[in-house]
Every structure is written in structure tokens, then in C-alpha cells.
């Protein structure tokens, strides 16, 4: 797992960005775009 | 100091639809994941969706995929909510809400919208 | 998606009280676990991040602990303003999900 404050701090933010590209569970992501956290 | 005003309360009939608005104020608007959260008595808190403010890019849970549509607005930093074919379950608080800064979690919430669907 | 179940869903309790709410995951999520706290008319408010962390605020009565699939908010002194309804919220995997509440009554 990541312990930074980054990774902590922005956990949600980095899944979200990253979920493009892939349907997991019961979610979809749409308008892939690519951003950095 | 980070605001989101939302707009106001909405009576709608089944099946039509319902877009609500929540305009940002305090930080850069572009540079957060805006996420919509909805409220109904007995059903608790249920995150519908998410729209990166700067690309458009939205995420969406498969329960509302077919209905929901989350845009944002950078020239007026406002986020949108619109849901369609409503129905009688559709009655609840609908709030925006932006992760924290420093901390994880929703650190900032708009005061909720009211929406209510009935005959 | 993860499960988040909270216990008891109410509870009667008397100013100066110590409360403890308890919530579970259904798997794994470390200590990615928030707290918030829910009044009538109002937006939910962001109490304790990450499991123990406190928000911007928050008094020094409140406070978390846990971790993996078990989790605690504690209430050391019930004060007038913490009769509300408290939820957790996993952020360790998308979606985000909430527990069903806990509604803190006065006695």
C-alpha cells in the first residue's frame, strides 16, 4: 500500500483519474481522459 | 473559503427530468474531482458520480449510468447534475461535494437540493 | 462494491454520555475510512479522514480508530450540538460507499 500524505491525501482523486479504460464492479467510467494527482 | 451554492428546490412529475446546478467559489475550479451525492429517507448517502472540472472526464455508478448526466462549466465554475426519467425513488436531498485538500474525504458540501417527484 | 454497515443504526444517549459507533467493511480498506456527521437541513460535515485524522475544526471530544474491516468514532462527552446522525465512508475503492447511519438521540 502507499503511506505518503499524497497517497493518502488524494486516494479517491488518483482512483478516479485511473479509472478510465476499465469497468470495474458496478461503475462506469466515461470521456477518458488522462490527468496527473 | 471554499463555497458551493447550489440551486434550489425542484417538484417534478415521473418521468421527466431535473438538472441541478452548484457553482464553486474559493479555489480554481478546473483542478478537483466534483462528486454528486444524493440523500433519500431510509436509503442513507449513495455517491452517484464524479466529473473531473478541467477535462469533463465523469464517472458514473452502473445504477445511474443510463440516466445520469454530470457536465461542468469552467467559464462559470459551475457543475451540473441532470437525472432523467425520474420516478418516485428519485425524491432526495441531491448534494455536490469536493474532496479536501490536505485530507482525504468530502470536505466541502454544497447545503443540497431538494428534489421531489410526484404526480 | 464495498459494504459498509454501521451499528447500532440509533442510539439514546444523555448530554455528557460517551457514545461509540461502529462500523464495518466488508473487506480490507486499511484505514481509508471517514467519518461525518448529518444534521436536518444541513450538508453533511467531514468529521475525522483517514480513521483517526481530524478535520479542520472538529472538537477533541470526537474520535476514530481502527482499521482493515473494523472501525470506531467515539464521542468521549455528548455535547447539545452532537444529537445528529453519523456516517462512515470508505474511500479505499470506487465506488465510494457510506454506511447506513447512526442517529444519536437525546435521552
Known amino acids: 500500500g502507499c503511506n505518503t500524505a499524497t497517497c493518502v491525501t488524494h486516494r479517491l482523486a488518483g482512483l478516479l483519474s485511473r479509472s478510465g479504460g476499465m469497468v470495474k464492479s458496478n461503475f462506469v467510467p466515461t470521456n477518458v481522459g488522462s490527468e496527473a494527482f | 473559503q471554499v463555497q458551493l451554492v447550489q440551486s434550489g428546490a425542484e417538484v417534478k412529475k415521473p418521468g421527466s427530468s431535473v438538472k441541478v446546478s452548484c457553482k464553486a467559489s474559493?479555489?480554481?475550479?478546473?483542478n478537483y474531482w466534483m462528486q454528486w451525492v444524493r440523500y433519500a429517507p431510509g436509503q442513507g448517502l449513495e455517491w452517484m458520480g464524479a466529473i473531473y472540472e478541467g477535462t469533463g472526464k465523469t464517472v458514473y455508478i452502473q445504477k445511474f449510468a443510463d440516466r445520469v448526466t454530470i457536465t461542468a462549466d469552467k467559464s462559470t465554475s459551475t457543475a451540473y447534475m441532470e437525472l432523467s426519467s425520474l420516478r418516485s425513488e428519485d425524491t432526495a436531498v441531491y448534494y455536490c461535494a469536493r474532496l479536501s485538500d490536505y485530507v482525504s474525504g468530502f470536505g466541502y458540501w454544497g447545503r443540497g437540493t431538494t428534489v421531489t417527484v410526484s404526480s | 462494491d464495498i459494504q459498509m454497515t454501521q451499528s447500532p443504526s440509533s442510539l439514546s444517549a444523555s448530554v455528557g454520555d460517551r457514545v461509540t459507533i461502529t462500523c464495518r467493511a466488508s473487506?480490507?480498506?486499511?484505514?481509508?475510512l471517514n467519518w461525518y456527521q448529518r444534521k436536518p437541513g444541513d450538508a453533511p460535515k467531514l468529521l475525522i479522514y483517514?480513521?483517526?485524522g481530524y478535520h479542520s475544526g472538529v472538537p477533541s471530544r470526537f474520535s476514530g480508530s481502527g482499521s482493515g474491516t473494523d472501525f470506531t468514532l467515539t464521542i468521549s462527552s455528548l455535547q447539545p450540538e452532537d444529537f445528529a446522525t453519523y456516517y462512515c465512508?470508505?474511500?479505499?475503492?470506487?465506488?465510494?460507499?457510506f454506511g447506513g447511519g447512526t442517529k444519536v438521540e437525546i435521552k
Open positions: 474559493g479555489y480554481t475550479f478546473g
Open positions: 483517514y480513521t483517526s
Open positions: 473487506k480490507d480498506i486499511s484505514k481509508y
Open positions: 465512508q470508505q474511500g479505499d475503492a470506487l465506488p465510494p460507499t
